[in-house]
């Protein structure tokens, strides 16, 4: 036999106390699927949260964060304070990035500057608290007689002659 509750559409609940009739979810509650025996209470976006999408009888409200904060966690379960570029959020608040590190966003942690020498390159533009270094051509490419504009020709495999 088919469960009578399976006929209850989203936006209703199957009321066991009323011979399994389909009752509408009360205001500020929802059921996103059919055949539900309860309605879920709508999320309320309060305080630092603000409403991105209103609750309806078939879907929950969605929250985001008020300016100066950003979402963390699934479904924006938390709001975390923004910092300025060049800073990171610590337990004591926003702190400037240490020398040798940078953060180009209002969230997240300070990351070390790229080590250009690991790629055999030179530093073209120094890093700051807000920006990573810009690596330039390798020092060999900048030796006298070498063009700093024309990139070196790609290496050819043995046995291939230029066209």
């Amino acid at each position: 036999l088919q469960d009578p509750c399976s006929n209850c559409p989203a936006g209703t609940f199957c009321d066991n106390n009323r011979n399994q009739i389909c009752s509408p979810c009360p205001p500020n509650s929802f059921s996103s699927a059919g055949g539900q025996r309860t309605c879920d209470i709508c999320r309320q976006c309060k305080g630092v949260f603000r409403t991105r999408k209103e609750c309806s009888s078939t879907s929950n409200a969605e929250c985001d964060c008020t300016p100066g904060f950003h979402c963390l966690g699934a479904g924006c379960s938390m709001c975390e304070q923004d910092c300025k570029q060049g800073q990171e959020l610590t337990k004591k608040g926003c702190k400037d990035c240490c020398f040798g590190t940078f953060n180009d966003q209002k969230r997240g942690i300070c990351r070390p500057w790229t080590n250009c020498s690991l790629d055999g390159k030179s530093v073209l533009v120094n890093g700051t608290k807000e920006r990573d270094v810009v690596c330039g051509p390798s020092p060999a490419d900048l030796s006298p007689g070498a063009s700093s504009v024309t990139p070196p020709a790609p290496a050819r495999e043995p046995g291939h002659s230029p066209q």
């Epitope: 609940f13 009321d15 066991n16 106390n17 979810c25 009360p26 205001p27 500020n28 509650s29 025996r37 309860t38 309605c39 879920d40 209470i41 709508c42 999320r43 309320q44």
Partner: nanobody, 120 residues
Framework: EVQLLESGGGLVQPGGSLRLSCAAS????????VGWFRQAPGKELQYVGT??????HYGDFENNRFTISRDNSKNTVYLQMNSLRAEDTAVYYC???????????????QGQGTLVTVSS
């Protein structure tokens, strides 16, 4: 920590009335459905009703004798019980949940209960 405190229970004669209160501390009722349950001596927990957002849902036994209401300013939900009978004797509990009605769900928080005795 959420705490629910029931009050208003006591001894009442058959046919009499009582109003039970459920007050929350540590959290407002704003985003919760509030339910009432009862447990008679030697019996299992029985669903009385749920209040949420101006709507009340009731168990199938009480036959319009019970009414659930709420006072937002006092963060309190009430259970008004009229025409009381001996079989209404029980410990009455309030509870909160993120679901409506609470007839088929386990509460998120439940109080300690208040005893109602209906006897002549």
């Amino acid at each position: 920590e959420v705490q629910l405190l029931e009050s208003g229970g006591g001894l009442v004669q058959p046919g009499g009335s009582l109003r039970l209160s459920c007050a929350a501390s540590g959290r407002t009722f704003d985003n919760y459905a509030v339910g009432w349950f009862r447990q008679a001596p030697g019996k299992e927990l029985q669903y009385v009703g749920t209040y949420w957002s101006g709507y009340a849902h009731y168990g199938d036994f009480e036959n319009n004798r019970f009414t659930i209401s709420r006072d937002n300013s006092k963060n309190t939900v009430y259970l008004q019980m009229n025409s009381l009978r001996a079989e209404d004797t029980a410990v009455y509990y309030c509870a909160i949940s993120l679901k409506y009605p609470m007839a088929t769900v386990t509460p998120d928080y439940q109080g300690q209960g208040t005893l109602v005795t209906v006897s002549s």
